[in-house]
C-alpha cells in the first residue's frame, strides 16, 4: 500500500492496489479518487490533477462510489398497480412495489417490474397458500364438512355449522342451514381471513444498478483495486 500520506493522484507501488474509494486510471497510470454517491466524474484524473466530480442532474443518480462519466437514469414512474416506496434522488433509484391485493410477477434487483392481481378463490374453494410479495394465492377445493361462499384472495374453507336438525345440508360453497333457531355450536361464526401480503422493501441494502442500465459493473466492486473505468378467479 502507498504511504499513509499519499494524496490522489499517486502512482501505486509495484504489486499494490489503490485504496478504498480510489480507482486505478489506466491512462494516467495513477490511483485517483472515486466520486461519492450522488456524484459522477466530470473530469477524469491526470498525472497531476485528481478526478473532478459533479452532482447528478435531476432524475439521475449514483448509489455507489464511482467514476462513471454520467449518472444513471432513474426508472420510469410507478404504474397504477404499484406504489413508490423509494423516491428518485441523486443517491438512489426510484423503487416501485406492488400495491395491496397484487403480487410481483416479475421482479428486479430492487422493487418490481410487473405486478399482477392476487388470484381470488371462487365459492367452493378456499385459500390453501396465501399470496406473498412475490407469489400468487393458491386455491384448493373445500374438503367435505367445510365451505367457502365468497370470492376472495384471503378466505379459507370454514367448517359447516353443526345443527341439532339440518334443514339444508352444507356443501363446498354453502354452509349448512339449521331448522332450530340456533345451532348447537358454530365452528366458525365469522369469515376467516388470511393476512394480506404487505409490500415491503428490504432495509439497509444498497442496491446496484442493473447491468443493462450501467456502463459496466466494474465500478460497483467495493473492495476491488479498481480495474479500468467502465462502466384471477378460479382454482
Amino acid at each position: 500500500l502507498p504511504a499513509q500520506v499519499a494524496f490522489t493522484p499517486y502512482a501505486p507501488e509495484p504489486g499494490s492496489t489503490c485504496r478504498l474509494r480510489e480507482y486505478y486510471d489506466q491512462t494516467a497510470q495513477m490511483c485517483c479518487s472515486k466520486c461519492s454517491p450522488g456524484q459522477h466524474a466530470k473530469v477524469f484524473c491526470t498525472k497531476t490533477s485528481d478526478t473532478v466530480c459533479d452532482s447528478c442532474e435531476d432524475s439521475t443518480y449514483t448509489q455507489l462510489w464511482n467514476w462513471v462519466p454520467e449518472c444513471l437514469s432513474c426508472g420510469s414512474r410507478c404504474s397504477s398497480d404499484q406504489v413508490e416506496t423509494q423516491a428518485c434522488t441523486r443517491e438512489q433509484n426510484r423503487i416501485c412495489t406492488c400495491r395491496p391485493g397484487w403480487y410481483c410477477a416479475l421482479s428486479k434487483q430492487e422493487g418490481c417490474r410487473l405486478c399482477a392481481p392476487l388470484r381470488k378463490c371462487r365459492p367452493g374453494f378456499g385459500v390453501a397458500r396465501p399470496g406473498t410479495e412475490t407469489s400468487d394465492v393458491v386455491c384448493k377445493p373445500c374438503a367435505p364438512g367445510t365451505f367457502s361462499n365468497t370470492t376472495s384472495s384471503t378466505d379459507i374453507c370454514r367448517p359447516h355449522q353443526i345443527c341439532n336438525v339440518v334443514a339444508i345440508p352444507g356443501n363446498a360453497s354453502m354452509d349448512a342451514v339449521c331448522t332450530s333457531t340456533s345451532p348447537t355450536r358454530s365452528m366458525a361464526p365469522g369469515a376467516v381471513h388470511l393476512p394480506q401480503p404487505v409490500s415491503t422493501r428490504s432495509q439497509h441494502t444498497q442496491p446496484t444498478p442493473e447491468p443493462s442500465t450501467a456502463p459496466s459493473t466494474s465500478f460497483l466492486l467495493p473492495m476491488g483495486p479498481s480495474p479500468p473505468a467502465e462502466g384471477s378467479t378460479g382454482d
Epitope: L1, T17, L20, W65, H204, T205, Q206, T208, M223, G224
Partner: antibody, heavy 119, light 107 residues
Framework: QVQLLESGGGLVQPGGSLRLSCAAS????????MSWVRQAPGKGLEWVSG????????FYADSVKGRFTISRDNSKNTLYLQMNSLRAEDTAVYYC????????????WGQGTLVTVSS | DIQMTQSPSSLSASVGDRVTITCQAS??????LNWYQQKPGKAPKLLIY???TLQTGVPSRFSGSGSGTDFTFTISSLQPEDIATYYC?????????FGQGTKVEIK
C-alpha cells in the same frame, strides 16, 4: 429475508485443510463484495479475506496469505473459503459477511461456523 | 496497517445511564469508521457507519461522532438489552481493522 448461512466448519489437525461455504439468500448476491471475518474463542474480530462482487479481485490478511483462498460462485449465490496448512491459531468462529457498498463495513453477517485446529 | 485502539476495554453502568466508548485510529481515517454490537453467542450487528450514520432499524439511543483519528460511540440511555461487546472498525483502507472491543455490563 436477507440471510447468510455458513457451513463446513469442524475439527481438523494442524496442517490439514477445510473448505467453508456461505449460502446467500434474499439479496442480489452478485452485486456485493463479500468477506470472511473470524473470532478466536474469547477474543475480538479479525478480518480474514475479501472478494469483489464479480470475483475478480481478492484480498487477504497477512496472517492467512498464501494459505487461504477466497472464491465465489455467483450462479449458486455461494461464497467459499479454502483453508490449507491450518494452524492452531486459526481456531475461531468464521463469519461470512456482506460488504456495505457505501461504507465498506459489514452490514449482513452469517451465524458463524466453528473451526477447531487441534491434534 | 491501521491500528484501532478502543477504550475502555470494559465498563459497568446502570440502566438509564449515558455510556461512552472511544476509538482512536493510528492515522487519519476521515469519517470511515463503523460501530458494531455483538451479543454473547451471536454474530456482530452493524449499528453505525461512516462515523455517525445510524443503520436502518437501529434505535436512536445509539449515536456516533468524530473524524480523523478520534471517534466516540454513545448510548444515551442504557437498556438491559444493550448488554454486549461493542467494536469499532475502520474502513478507510484494506486491510480493514477492528478495535479490541468494549464489554458493556449492567451494574
Amino acid at each position: 429475508q436477507v440471510q447468510l448461512l455458513e457451513s463446513g466448519g469442524g475439527l481438523v489437525q494442524p496442517g490439514g485443510s477445510l473448505r467453508l461455504s456461505c449460502a446467500a439468500s434474499g439479496f442480489s448476491f452478485s452485486s456485493y463484495a463479500m468477506s470472511w471475518v473470524r473470532q478466536a474463542p474469547g477474543k475480538g474480530l479479525e478480518w480474514v479475506s475479501g472478494i469483489s462482487a464479480g470475483g475478480g479481485e481478492t484480498f487477504y490478511a497477512d496472517s492467512v496469505k498464501g494459505r487461504f483462498t477466497i472464491s465465489r460462485d455467483n450462479s449458486k449465490n455461494t461464497l467459499y473459503l479454502q483453508m490449507n496448512s491450518l494452524r492452531a491459531e486459526d481456531t475461531a468462529v468464521y463469519y461470512c459477511a456482506r460488504v456495505h457498498p457505501i461504507s465498506y463495513g459489514f452490514d449482513i453477517w452469517g451465524q458463524g461456523t466453528l473451526v477447531t485446529v487441534s491434534s | 496497517d491501521i491500528q484501532m485502539t478502543q477504550s475502555p476495554s470494559s465498563l459497568s453502568a446502570s440502566v438509564g445511564d449515558r455510556v461512552t466508548i472511544t476509538c482512536q485510529a493510528s492515522q487519519d481515517i476521515k469519517k470511515y469508521l463503523n460501530w458494531y454490537q455483538q451479543k454473547p453467542g451471536k454474530a456482530p450487528k452493524l449499528l453505525i457507519y461512516d462515523a455517525s450514520t445510524l443503520q436502518t432499524g437501529v434505535p436512536s439511543r445509539f449515536s456516533g461522532s468524530g473524524s480523523g483519528t478520534d471517534f466516540t460511540f454513545t448510548i444515551s440511555s442504557l437498556q438491559p438489552e444493550d448488554i454486549a461487546t461493542y467494536y469499532c472498525q475502520q474502513s478507510d483502507n484494506t486491510p480493514v481493522t477492528f478495535g479490541q472491543g468494549t464489554k458493556v455490563e449492567i451494574k
